[in-house]
Interface confidence: low
């Protein structure tokens, strides 16, 4: 068996740090056997078998010119092996951040804080931290650790599924390369990192007969759980074309009737979502949807929903029948919602 410990990385490659002494190990001989060392492609002997260093080659203060392939051979000239030297640096603590698009799962991403120049991998795990008692500031021993499964496609991301909203988690991301390992610990509370995805399916429709009204409707983001214990609240912004400033309202449900639109002008509308108890932050804005208030009077045919007015709107009178209020139903998939046991 080889006298050389195999560092993590491609086989046949050994590693060192610039400016430091580097030892290369001849893989195909017995430990302590005297060998000769050559630089691949160059006949000059780097170190003879009488060096007293056995199967190792010592390069003092290695620099980039020492990188490359080396050949070691036994006393009788047989090839002991080829070794490629690659120089780089030990890992530094990675930069880690976590985010959640719903209240049951969160993901963490990382990036190196310094480039090591060496093959690098990351070990990712997490522990759940629980408080012992209501008044106690002490924490029980952490439960776990459990692996934080990494994206299979090699993206620097891992996902914790089935997280508990009220728990705190300690994320461990360890950068590993052949010269060592370095760990970053990050304490994460789902409440603080929650940022829903933007609402989906935003539609903006005119309200026939009401030249200053627009009806906007949308749905929950697909990433929000189908049977949510936590609802979302919404923020809607709208503005006429060419107007720089947005008007903002906080709708009560999944639609909103804008009553102060500018007649005849297209309007941009966008919506954002947030946990209804203000955990985390607002989502990014949805893609803008556009709509233009209706013009003209209502036709005399049987009125469709939302077309109940028989005269065009200027300023609605107090007793004029308004279109139905937007539904307060928080989620289209909650019609038969029962808490699971």
């Amino acid at each position: 068996s080889s006298p050389c410990p195999q560092a993590w990385g491609p086989p046949g490659v050994q590693y060192g740090q610039p400016g430091r002494s580097v030892k290369l190990c001849c893989p195909g001989v017995t430990a302590g056997d005297p060998v000769s060392w050559f630089r691949d492609g160059e006949p000059k002997l780097l170190q003879g078998p009488d060096s007293g260093l056995g199967h190792e080659l010592v390069l003092a203060q290695a620099d980039s010119t020492d990188e490359g392939t080396y050949i070691c051979q036994t006393l009788d000239g047989a090839l002991g092996g080829t070794v490629t030297l690659q120089l780089g640096y030990p890992p530094a603590r990675p930069v880690v951040s976590c985010q959640a698009a719903d209240y049951e799962n969160f993901s963490c991403t990382w990036s190196p804080s310094q480039i090591s120049g060496l093959p690098t991998r990351y070990l990712t795990s997490y522990r759940k931290k629980t408080v012992l008692g209501a008044d106690s500031q002490r924490r029980s021993p952490s439960t776990g650790p459990w692996p934080c499964p990494q994206d299979p496609l090699g993206a620097a991301r891992c996902v914790v599924h089935g997280a508990e909203f009220w728990s705190q988690y300690r994320i461990n991301v360890t950068e590993v390369n052949p010269l060592g390992a370095s760990t970053r610990l990050l304490d994460v509370s789902l409440q603080s990192i929650l940022r829903p995805d933007p609402p989906q399916g935003l539609r903006v429709e005119s309200v026939p007969g009401y030249p200053r009204r627009l009806r906007a409707s949308w749905t929950y983001p697909a990433s929000w759980p189908c049977q949510p214990h936590f609802l979302l609240k919404f923020r809607l912004q709208y503005r006429p074309a060419q107007h720089p400033a947005w008007s903002t309202v906080e709708p009560a449900g999944l639609e909103e009737v804008i009553t102060d639109a500018v007649a005849g002008l297209p309007h941009a509308v966008r919506v954002s979502a947030r946990d209804f108890l203000d955990a985390g932050t607002w989502s990014t804005w949805s893609p803008e949807a556009w709509g233009t208030p209706s013009t003209g009077t209502i036709p005399k045919e049987i009125p469709a929903w939302g077309q109940l007015h028989t005269q065009p709107e200027v300023e609605p009178q107090v007793d004029s029948p308004a279109p139905p209020r937007p539904s307060l139903q928080p989620h289209p998939r909650l019609l038969d919602h029962r808490d699971s046991v």
Epitope: D40, G41, T69, L79, T82
Partner: antibody
Framework: QVQLVQSGAEVKKPGASVKVSCKAS????????MHWLRQRPGQGLEWIGN????????HYNQKFKDRVTMTVDKSTSTAYMELSSLRSEDTAVYYC??????????WGQGTLVTVSS | DIVLTQSPATLSLSPGERATLSCRAS??????LHWYQQKSGQAPRLLIK???QSISGIPARFSGSGSGTDFTLTISSLETEDFAVYFC?????????FGQGTKLEIK
């Protein structure tokens, strides 16, 4: 000393195939990549591809990808390059070259392949 | 593919003079550039690797410099046996490509 000895000159008709061999000696065959290159009359050098003799992993120049096959016979320390669907523009001296992954340190003497109807 | 352009195409100098050959890459290739010498009827010979690293057995009068897109091969004092064709080669991306060559001839 390192030696790469290539097969002799070939004359082929358009549409035919040619297989050039390169017998290596003087070093451990399975420790080095073998590259194939060509040089058309009075022209520059063109890299065709390479093969790792220990694992036979290849990298081909896309220009030749559909027409070239590189193989090795470790038992005889010989590398082979076959080029199919020959055309007159393939008339060239073909070289094998021992090197690392991307460099060409030792070269064969070259094999002239003439494609003519 | 990365294109390497060598200049001049032909360089006429006398023995003892200094020769400067240029190679320009169509995109930045860091230092992944190598120089070869080819004498008439012979296979090429590696002179310089990775822009400036010398090769064992190559006379010290051969040196290389450059990084990014512009590279230079310098022969400090020409010997008779240096009159040949010189090629640059890049190893930044597949396929490996060569310049069209500079012919160094006796004036």
């Amino acid at each position: 000393q390192v030696q790469l000895v290539q097969s002799g000159a070939e004359v082929k008709k358009p549409g035919a195939s040619v297989k050039v061999s390169c017998k290596a000696s003087g070093y451990t065959f399975t420790n080095y990549w073998m590259h194939w290159l060509r040089q058309r009359p009075g022209q520059g050098l063109e890299w065709i591809g390479n093969i790792g003799p220990s694992d036979s992993k290849t990298h081909y120049n896309q220009k030749f990808k559909d027409r070239v096959t590189m193989t090795v016979d470790k038992s005889t320390s010989t590398a082979y390059m076959e080029l199919s669907s020959l055309r007159s523009e393939d008339t060239a001296v073909y070289y094998c070259a021992r090197g690392d992954y991307v460099l060409f340190t030792y070269w064969g003497q070259g094999t002239l392949v003439t494609v003519s109807s | 593919d990365i294109v390497l352009t060598q200049s001049p195409a032909t360089l006429s100098l006398s023995p003892g003079e200094r020769a400067t050959l240029s190679c320009r890459a169509s995109q930045s290739i860091s230092n992944n550039l190598h120089w070869y010498q080819q004498k008439s009827g012979q296979a090429p010979r590696l002179l310089i690797k990775y822009a400036s690293q010398s090769i064992s057995g190559i006379p010290a009068r051969f040196s290389g410099s450059g990084s990014g897109t512009d590279f230079t091969l310098t022969i400090s004092s020409l010997e008779t046996e240096d009159f040949a064709v010189y090629f640059c080669q890049q190893s930044y991306s597949w396929p490996l490509t060569f310049g069209q060559g500079t012919k160094l001839e006796i004036k």
